[in-house]
């Protein structure tokens, strides 16, 4: 560590003292086997080369072994997310060994100094794993390293240094500063384990990106585009804190990766699915809801190993809290013609009616201009499971692109008071469910009346041919 008074410096000073005056030095990296869900329970400390604690603490050599690796800390104490993750792992994998890697002395530094300590911590974990491998029945393939923020890169170093290949590394919003664009040996990368899956929840193209933006695993999942997480806006944190500040927003969004992973452990019956896409904008347009050729996957603990993929970017929308799952739909709306539209840009709203429930009125986010005489694709998502869709209500409003256009519209209206109303002609809506992969076409309830003015509604019902499931669609994940 470059800091002259960092813990490593202290350690070196201690070791150079004569034996008689050496004080007891706490190791910079400790391995705490959590034997209980109770955060107050101290657990057992494993010690390299000492087999007794393994036996005393009931370390199960044949079971899965999780290593939880925290990140940089300003407080120098374990944060609440760690206890939640320990508890969730114990709940899901009752026989597993859950080891917390405590590198607080090396992480409780200036961020930049903590970064420079990641390599040595990764090396310590690798040495522990090498020693465990000498034991009968212990398999590196059963090891799952889970690293949050800076801890994700520590996991990368551990996977790189260990003799053999770790089964899995999960990076929970791996840290960005000093790692973005770095060489693969100096950050988490797909080479560090048999399967590396990553959740990115705080990436920014402006300001400082606390989470790494670049893909660093076999699959890289970007919930809500990997940037603005629902429930983490300043207004949201203002409601729950004495002072809502940017740091609270940062913490909320950065830590969201951990909570998404915890959710995947405890809400097994409500898995969230992510869909492969080249970028966030294409996903927002609803283009990427395919499960063909391994293009979709569960997120978090339930993610399926896709070793053939590298740096595969996947996207999904989520709720603001647990359970995070939403239901994604692709909507294709063919706008046949505009009538007296001028410079007005339409904003569509849909309400979906299903066998289980009805949605709220949902705005269709416009990523690009709506094209006339063309099929426009949108992404919508609902927080509740609607079941099979029965009908859709569509409305639209005109949103002017600029004050100048608004003035032009007003002038045009005033000069031609008998100007017929603006209208759009929409005859059908094609819908695809991301979660079920089902495709359906909805036709206008009245085929003779498919024009719609602002504020008016148009109803669409399932076309007579009913549900159409494409034969080639065979989801590679267990879809509900």
């Amino acid at each position: 560590s470059p800091t002259p008074f960092g813990p490593e410096g202290q350690l070196a000073d201690e070791l150079h003292k004569p034996k008689a005056i050496q004080t007891e030095v706490k190791p910079s990296v400790r391995f705490n086997l959590r034997t209980s869900k109770d955060p107050e329970h101290e657990g057992c400390y494993l010690s390299l080369g000492h087999s007794q604690p393994l036996e005393d603490c009931g370390f199960n050599m044949t079971a899965k072994t999780f290593f939880i690796i925290h990140g940089w800390t300003m407080s120098g104490i374990f944060e609440n997310w760690l206890h939640k993750l320990v508890s969730a792992l114990h709940t899901r994998e009752k026989d597993a060994n859950v080891v917390v890697v405590d590198w607080l002395p090396l992480a409780h530094q200036l961020y930049t100094d903590a970064v420079n300590n990641t390599r040595v911590v990764g090396h310590s974990i690798a040495r522990m794993l090498d020693w465990l491998q000498e034991k009968d029945d212990f398999s590196l393939g059963n090891v799952h390293l889970i690293g949050y923020s800076l801890g994700a890169h520590v996991a990368g170093y551990a996977g790189n240094f260990v003799k053999g290949t770790v089964g899995r590394i999960t990076g929970l919003d791996p840290a960005g500063p000093m790692f973005e664009g770095a060489d693969i040996h100096k950050r988490l990368s797909p080479d560090d384990a048999d399967f590396v899956d990553v959740l990115h929840t705080y990436t920014r193209s402006f300001g400082l990106s606390i989470g790494i933006q670049m893909p660093v695993g076999h699959i890289d999942i970007y919930p809500n585009g990997g940037d603005f997480q629902p429930g983490c806006g300043l207004n949201d944190v203002l409601g729950s804190m004495a002072y809502g500040t940017i740091t609270e927003v940062v913490k909320c969004e950065h830590e969201r990766a951990v909570h998404l992973f915890v959710d995947s452990l405890v809400n097994q019956d409500k898995p969230s699915f992510a869909f492969q896409c080249t970028d966030s904008n294409r996903f927002k347009k609803g283009i990427c809801l395919s499960c063909r050729k391994n293009r979709c996957n569960s997120i978090g603990y339930n993610a399926k190993k896709m070793r053939n993929k590298r740096n595969s970017k996947m996207y999904l929308k989520t709720r603001a809290g647990m359970p995070f799952r939403v239901y994604h739909y692709q909507m294709k709306i063919h706008v046949f013609s505009y009538k007296n539209m001028g410079e007005i840009e339409p904003t569509f709203y849909v309400t979906l009616y299903g066998t289980n429930a009805d949605s709220q009125t949902l705005p269709l986010e416009i990523v690009e201009r709506i094209e006339q005489n063309a099929t426009n694709t949108f992404l919508v998502y609902t927080e509740e499971d609607l079941g099979d869709l029965l009908k859709i209500q569509l409305t639209w409003e005109g949103a002017s692109q600029s004050w100048y256009n608004l003035w032009k519209e007003l002038r045009s209206y005033l000069s031609q008071p008998h100007n017929p109303g603006r209208e759009l002609n929409i005859r059908r809506i094609r819908v695809k469910s991301g979660e079920t992969q089902r495709k359906l076409t909805f036709c206008a309830e009245d085929p003779e009346n498919t024009s719609i003015s602002p504020g008016r509604e148009l109803w669409f019902r399932k076309c007579r041919d009913g549900w159409r499931m494409k034969n080639e669609t065979s989801p590679t994940v267990e879809l509900p």
Epitope: P177, M178, Y243
Partner: antibody, heavy 119, light 107 residues
Framework: QVQLQQSGAELVKPGASVRLSCKAS????????IHWVKQRSGQGLEWIGW????????KYNEKFKDKATLTADKSSRTVYMELSRLTSEDSAVYFC????????????WGQGTLVTVSA | DIQMTQTTSSLSASLGDRVTISCRAS??????LNWYQQQPDGTVKLLIY???RLHSGVPSRFSGSGSGTDYSLTISNLEQEDIATYFC?????????FGGGTNLEIK
Amino acid sequence: QVQLQQSGAELVKPGASVRLSCKASGYTFTKYTIHWVKQRSGQGLEWIGWFYPGSDSIKYNEKFKDKATLTADKSSRTVYMELSRLTSEDSAVYFCARHEEYTNSLAYWGQGTLVTVSA
Amino acid sequence: DIQMTQTTSSLSASLGDRVTISCRASQDISNYLNWYQQQPDGTVKLLIYYTSRLHSGVPSRFSGSGSGTDYSLTISNLEQEDIATYFCQQGYTLPWTFGGGTNLEIK
């Protein structure tokens, strides 16, 4: 909004001690580190050290570790810096400032406290 | 300790000018370079953090660039209120260190 209010100017005798205060408002006090910076007349800035109220964590610049002592009172949301064994070299304006995590920058500054050491 | 050097201690420019202030670190500081403005009344403000990111509320005429050991602050269209002293600071490792400052004056 974030504010750091520093105590008033001090005139002290050589060899004496002085305690400067920095009262924070407009944010969660325990979540941010407060730094102290020295500026001698017409000169540059020197980093003295930091105090993190969340865990009472302190770091000093080696140069100031026998000169400055940082403490805090969470109830009044105030960080203190005591300067001891004062000499004319300690005559300066002392600023407190709030640390921004990850960027390692000082985003908000107090107005400064002038300390004059004179017999 | 990392030494921060601002070679120009004083700079004269006209209103509307494009002004560049440079800062050099004695070793690579991985973009952990911040710029501060100290106004004549002593008030200190953060302008740029992490080499090029504009702090909230800072006018867009201020910009920062650089990497490794060499960094610069540019004011694209000098205004009267920009007359101040500018300091660079490295946040890469402790102890944090500042440049000696560049005093900007009107010609």
